[in-house]
Interface confidence: medium
């Protein structure tokens, strides 16, 4: 239960986390299980311990083995085991199964491929991506933070994806690669004319001048993968970005949820420091998909302060 498999390639950086978790203040001791020899914490060593992390900078085939970590607190000790295997680099393009991280599935709507284990490393952009050993090129592929986004996913996009990045440790750079398979799901569903759940048509929302206010535009579109479905806000018939009022911002990205099996999207409009002039604006929640566009209009009204006098 408290044993974890980790693997890497020779001459690349490998960082392993102790399978037993503890507070950052707890001390963690690492040992090489075969010899019971303590792993040093001095960073000048090629293999050293750094709290919950065991670092191989870079890794060598001879580093393979079981490592023991002991998380020590004032009241208890917890022991975990890291089973580390370092492999020789392959001369050909094939990535063997034992070097593959978990398979991820994608669809037209969601095609993110996360770079495995990257959160353990001190890396900086750019993150490079390869499919079946070929560097990915073209506008359909976007390396975004620690994941790859593929636009207009097709069945041909299935395959083995490798991310490559540089880990920096005290000014020294080490290469890291990680590979995982990506499969494409063909989701059968149906779509409907958008149904806006909130706000109600011609809703009046009470707000307090000087306070912050949130408006949520929420709509459902059908079942399964929804093609070109979207929700957004407009101000006086203009895109939020074009309206030019920095206090009024649309939340980045659309949150997807499922209500009674239906695919729904919502978008939050945030108004900071509500002003009198905001009450004069027309706020339109737009929901659209391949069947059309539906628009619900909201206006703001001043919330009357509660009268505490009898």
């Amino acid at each position: 239960k408290f044993s974890k498999q980790s693997w890497g390639l020779e001459n690349e950086a490998l960082i392993v986390r102790c399978p037993r978790q503890g507070k950052p203040s707890y001390t963690v001791d690492w040992y090489y299980s075969q010899t019971n020899k303590s792993i040093p914490t001095q960073e000048r060593n090629r293999v050293f311990a750094s709290g919950q992390l065991l670092k191989f900078l870079p890794a060598a085939v001879a580093d393979s083995g079981i490592y023991t970590c002991i998380v020590r607190s004032p009241t208890f000790n917890r022991t975990g085991y890291a089973n580390v295997t370092i492999y020789k680099k392959q001369s050909d393009c094939n990535v063997p199964d034992y070097l593959m991280y978990s398979t991820v599935s994608g669809s037209e709507k969601n095609s993110k491929i996360y770079c495995p284990t990257i959160d353990l490393y001190n890396w900086t952009a750019p993150l490079e991506w390869f499919k079946n050993c070929q560097a990915l090129q073209g506008s359909r592929y976007r390396a975004h933070k620690s994941f790859l986004v593929i636009d207009n996913v097709m069945t041909e996009d299935a395959g083995d994806y490798t991310c490559k990045f540089i880990h920096n440790e005290n000014g020294a750079n080490y290469s890291v690669t990680a590979t995982r398979s990506f499969t494409v799901k063909d989701e059968q569903g149906f779509s409907l004319f958008p149904v806006i759940g909130a706000p109600a048509q011609n809703e009046i929302k009470e707000v307090e001048i000087g306070k912050n206010a949130n408006l949520t535009c929420s709509a459902c579109f059908g079942k399964g993968t929804q093609f070109l479905a979207a929700v957004l806000w407009q101000l006086n018939g203009t895109k939020i970005t074009d309206f030019g009022e920095p206090r009024i911002q649309q939340e980045e990205g659309q949150n997807q949820s499922f209500s009674n099996g239906l695919a729904c999207l919502d978008m939050v409009l945030r108004i900071a420091d509500v002003k009198e002039e905001d009450l004069l604006l027309q706020y339109d929640c737009l929901a659209l998909n391949l069947h059309g566009l539906r628009r619900h209009t909201v206006r703001l009204s001043r919330k009357n302060p509660i009268d505490h006098h009898s």
Epitope: E108, F190, S191, F227, L228, A230, L232, K239, L286, L288, L290, H291, G292, L293
Partner: antibody, heavy 116, light 107 residues
């Protein structure tokens, strides 16, 4: 009245690109999808792709994936369809069409001839 | 993708007669079906959407029916201007697909 006016006929060499424009008037350009459909001589209609100007998002038929790019300029209410790596079988009339799922208004069509 | 199949490929009808055109989908498209008319050298024109709703300005002699996988376009009394090619199109799921067309010619 609502209308879509397309750019004029083009003659192109194989391997080159063509960019067809479609200027919309008489309706709120950003409120509707703009589709592109082509028709080879004596053949039926073939859907190529669609753009939603309000989102700036486009979607393409798998057959044209990687070769077609559909864009929109809100300021001029104009949609564009660019097709690259042209081959002789791309010789066709290219139509823009406004609508959601059904296309209620069509452009007059742009004849693109690909010939060496 | 959903394949749309129209029949017959050609329909020969005399003016004033009734014409019935069929369209079949390879899987259910609910009522998300449109019919278009195209005359030589012209762009297509929308006749019917939602399987049975006439588009703006379309004469009452054009009617659409059906749902799921079987659809029919009926022209109750053919006028000279109705001789053209007719296409059905589904917009139930991506990608949008058209039938191969039915040519209505003068008998």
């Amino acid at each position: 009245q609502v209308q879509l006016v397309q750019s004029g006929a083009e003659v192109k060499k194989p391997g080159s690109s063509v960019k067809v424009s479609c200027k919309a008037s008489g309706y709120t350009f950003t409120d509707y999808y703009m589709h592109w459909v082509r028709q080879a001589p004596g053949q039926g209609l073939e859907w190529m792709g669609v753009i939603i100007p309000v989102l700036g998002a486009a979607k393409y038929a798998q057959k044209f994936q990687g070769r077609v790019t559909i864009t929109a300029d809100e300021s001029t209410s104009t949609a564009y369809m660019e097709l690259s790596s042209l081959r002789s079988e791309d010789t066709a009339v290219y139509y823009c069409a406004k609508g959601w799922g059904a296309f209620d208004i069509w452009g007059q069509g742009t004849m693109v001839t690909v010939s060496s | 993708e959903i394949v749309m199949t129209q029949s017959p490929a050609t329909l020969s009808v005399s003016p004033g007669e009734r014409a019935t055109l069929s369209c079949r989908a390879s899987q259910s498209v609910s009522s998300y079906l449109a019919w278009y008319q195209q005359k030589p050298g012209q762009a297509p024109r929308l006749l019917i959407y939602g399987a049975s709703t006439r588009a703006s300005g379309i004469p009452a002699r054009f009617s659409g029916s059906g749902s799921g996988t079987e659809f029919t376009l009926t022209i109750s009394s053919l006028q000279s201007e109705d001789f053209a090619v007719y296409y059905c199109q589904q917009y139930y799921s991506y990608p949008w697909t058209f039938g191969q067309g039915t040519k209505v010619e003068i008998k």
